[in-house]
């Protein structure tokens, strides 16, 4: 009987990230008796829901239940049945739903109502669905990466748990790129945060953090592309848009009604003499970069310094983890290596965008054409946003680490969100029980 394995004393939590382009379900696991320790929660599963983001179900809400089924059933399989009822489920919706709420609060509520009804039918402890704020999205992303990097631990390690981790206890900044918004969050060096809306105060594990955060709604990669198209079609002489952000030979028809569907293009909206136009790619990185820069208003700044659109941004400080679409796009382009300089990234983007569309399709035959066609724009947009938007330089580029996972857990806001809602990040440093952290007795 002595060799019989004791039942694992573990807990689980589920967070659904309802993003603008898709929904992902994450399952987290941790030892029950170590809830307040730093770094003990880890991701055991990610399930990507098939289909678009929940905001796209506005005219077909009855399909939401089926949409969520596969991943919720996967959660049923992964989590032991005996723990279903005590496993919390949280759904957080981000910028796609923020935009829908701007268009129609009633429609956004309806989508969330149906999501809640669907998720309530599962045997878990469903805690509700809500649209998280941009500030929360930034803050929880920052908490996630620093929790996983062990930055909140008071014990300085002599070893590094991940290749890009510095051994000091300075926190990493967080750079998050979604489809509809982008967040920048970091601890500035002895700098007053001049705008109260961008200031957060945390006390975590006995230490105070004054954190800067901002979420730029409409500046996620998908909405930025819609903005750019809406801006560029204003000056097109006919229904052909020669676009430097798409590969030479690429062609796509766009409905004007689709272009003006999002609140993000309202500022560029005008009556056009056609209902459709055709994008014709010309694949020129430099021109694409210039076109993207026109989305950033840098002419107005009521503070000592700004990012763009009059939004305060303190001087950049320390290392940054760039995740979500920052990582996915750069990974596809093979540009996530620590050794690739900003100049090299720019050179590779120039070459990539100039490649003919037919050649690109052949080289990446397994990739969906919709996604494949947009990597030139997305890569150029990332460079423009980081360099001109956030004022990274060729030197400070070395401090950006493109991160997919840390210790097997995805970088993103979901882990930080769950840690907060389950009260697993104490304000004070927990008293360590005797021997609990000892390597040798």
């Amino acid at each position: 009987t002595q060799n019989k394995a004791l039942p694992e004393n573990v807990k689980y939590g589920i967070v659904l990230d309802a993003g603008s382009s898709h929904t992902s379900l994450y399952i987290y696991k941790w030892p029950a008796e170590k809830e307040n320790d730093t770094g003990v929660v880890h991701q055991v599963e990610e399930c990507r829901v098939k289909g678009p983001g929940i905001s796209k179900f506005v005219q077909k809400v009855d399909e939401i239940g089926i949409y969520l089924t596969d991943c919720m059933e996967r959660a049923r399989e992964v989590i032991p049945r005996s723990q279903h009822q005590e496993t919390p489920v949280y759904l957080g919706a981000t910028a796609g739903m923020r935009l829908l709420r701007m268009e129609s609060e009633e429609l956004a509520d309806r989508v969330l109502d149906v999501v809640e009804t669907s998720l309530s039918n599962y045997p878990f402890d469903f805690q509700g669905a809500r649209i998280i704020t941009g500030q929360e999205e930034g803050a929880y992303g920052w908490i996630t990466i620093n929790y996983l990097l062990g930055k909140f631990s008071q014990k300085t390690r002599w070893f590094s748990i991940v290749p890009y981790e510095t051994n000091n206890q300075e926190t990493f900044g967080a750079l998050d790129l979604g489809g509809a918004s982008t967040q920048v969050t970091f601890v500035p060096q002895n700098q007053t945060i001049e705008s109260p809306d961008n200031a957060l105060q945390f006390r975590l594990y006995g230490k105070d953090y004054n954190v800067y955060t901002h979420s730029f709604l409409c500046y996620g990669k998908d909405q930025a592309l819609w903005q750019k198209l809406a801006k560029d079609i204003q000056v097109a002489s006919n229904e052909i848009l020669r676009d430097p952000c798409f590969h030479p030979g690429y062609k796509k028809v766009v409905n004007v009604s689709d272009l003006y569907k999002t609140p993000c293009t309202k500022r560029f909206e005008m009556t056009l003499p056609f209902q459709q136009f055709e994008i014709q790619g010309i694949g020129n990185y430099q021109q694409c970069h210039q076109s993207i820069l026109e989305l950033f208003n840098t002419s107005y700044c009521p503070y000592s310094q700004c990012a763009f659109n009059g939004i305060f941004l303190p001087p950049l400080q320390g290392d940054f983890g760039a995740f979500s679409a920052f990582y996915f796009v750069m990974k596809f382009l093979n540009l996530t290596s620590e050794k690739v300089s900003q100049e090299k990234v720019t050179e590779m983007m120039k070459k990539f965008c100039a490649q003919p569309w037919e050649e690109i399709k052949t080289s990446y035959a397994g990739v969906k054409e919709k996604y494949l066609s947009e990597y030139c724009f997305s890569g150029t947009y990332i460079l423009s946003l980081l360099l001109q938007g956030y004022h990274f330089t060729a030197d400070s580029w070395e401090h950006i680490h493109f991160i997919g996972k840390i210790q097997g857990s995805d970088a993103g806001w979901t882990l930080g969100y769950m840690l907060n809602l389950t009260n697993m990040i104490p304000a004070e440093q927990p008293l360590s029980t005797p021997l609990s952290h000892s390597t040798y007795v």
């Epitope: 609060e105 969330l112 109502d113 509700g128 669905a129 809500r130 649209i131 704020t133």
Partner: antibody, heavy 121, light 107 residues
């Protein structure tokens, strides 16, 4: 469908307290704020305050502070409004009304049927 | 607190006519925080318009809202028999306040 069902009519003496209930169904109770509005006979609408059922936090109109208490029971999806030190001018129909989700705007989407409270010696 | 003044107090019109109801705020109100309700005798109020101009689900398109700042209007393009009722405007700015109401009665 969303339903808000209120408790029955009450007759109270001046100085007493009244507790009106509002049972919600057809939606996730914790996701929407609940408001209380009253209407004296032949008069207009008067907002009393609101409760966030998720955390139990409340916000009362200045006029009613110190006299009104709003509570909720998440196990039964019910909110309560208790008004103390009743006087004759508190005679009114009391309505519960479902408000916004977090981050939304304050308009009252769905109303209960109303509870008549009569204060008379 | 913001005071809402509705006018006229009573509007006497015939079915098929156009009704224009006014709501004036004592200080500027963000458009997203202005709503209109309809109340019939013995019934609870019913939301008609939110965000100054958005029709609530199921509300006929003869009802429309407009205005900004301190002046808001509810228009009923062609009065139907079931539209004769009391109409209230409501704002939110820290606290909710209602206007005194406009009674639309049959002439």
């Amino acid at each position: 469908q969303v339903q808000l069902v209120q408790s029955g009519a009450e007759v109270k003496k001046p100085g007493a307290s009244v507790k009106v209930s509002c049972k919600a169904s057809g939606y996730t109770f914790k996701s929407y704020e609940m408001h209380w509005v009253r209407q004296a006979p032949g008069q207009g609408l008067e907002w009393m305050g609101r409760i966030n059922p998720s955390v139990g936090s409340t916000w009362y109109a200045q006029k009613f502070q110190g006299r009104v208490t709003m509570t909720r029971d998440t196990s039964t999806s019910t909110v309560y409004m208790e008004l103390s030190s009743l006087r004759s001018e508190d005679t009114a129909v009391y309505y519960c009304a479902r408000g916004k989700r977090e981050g939304g705007t304050e308009y009252l989407r769905k109303w209960g049927q109303g509870t008549l409270v009569t204060v008379s010696s | 607190e913001i005071v809402l003044t509705q006018s006229p107090g009573t509007l006497s019109l015939s079915p098929g006519e156009r009704a224009t109801l006014s709501c004036r705020a004592s200080q500027s109100v963000a458009s997203s925080y202005l709503a209109w309700y309809q109340q019939k005798p013995g019934q609870a109020p019913r939301l008609l318009i939110y965000g100054a101009s958005n029709r609530h689900t199921g509300i006929p398109d003869r009802f429309s809202g407009s205005g900004s700042g301190t002046d808001f209007t509810l228009t009923i393009s062609r009065l139907e028999p079931e539209d004769f009722a009391v109409y209230y405007c409501q704002q939110y700015h820290n606290a909710i306040t209602f206007g005194g109401g406009t009674k639309v009665e049959i002439k």
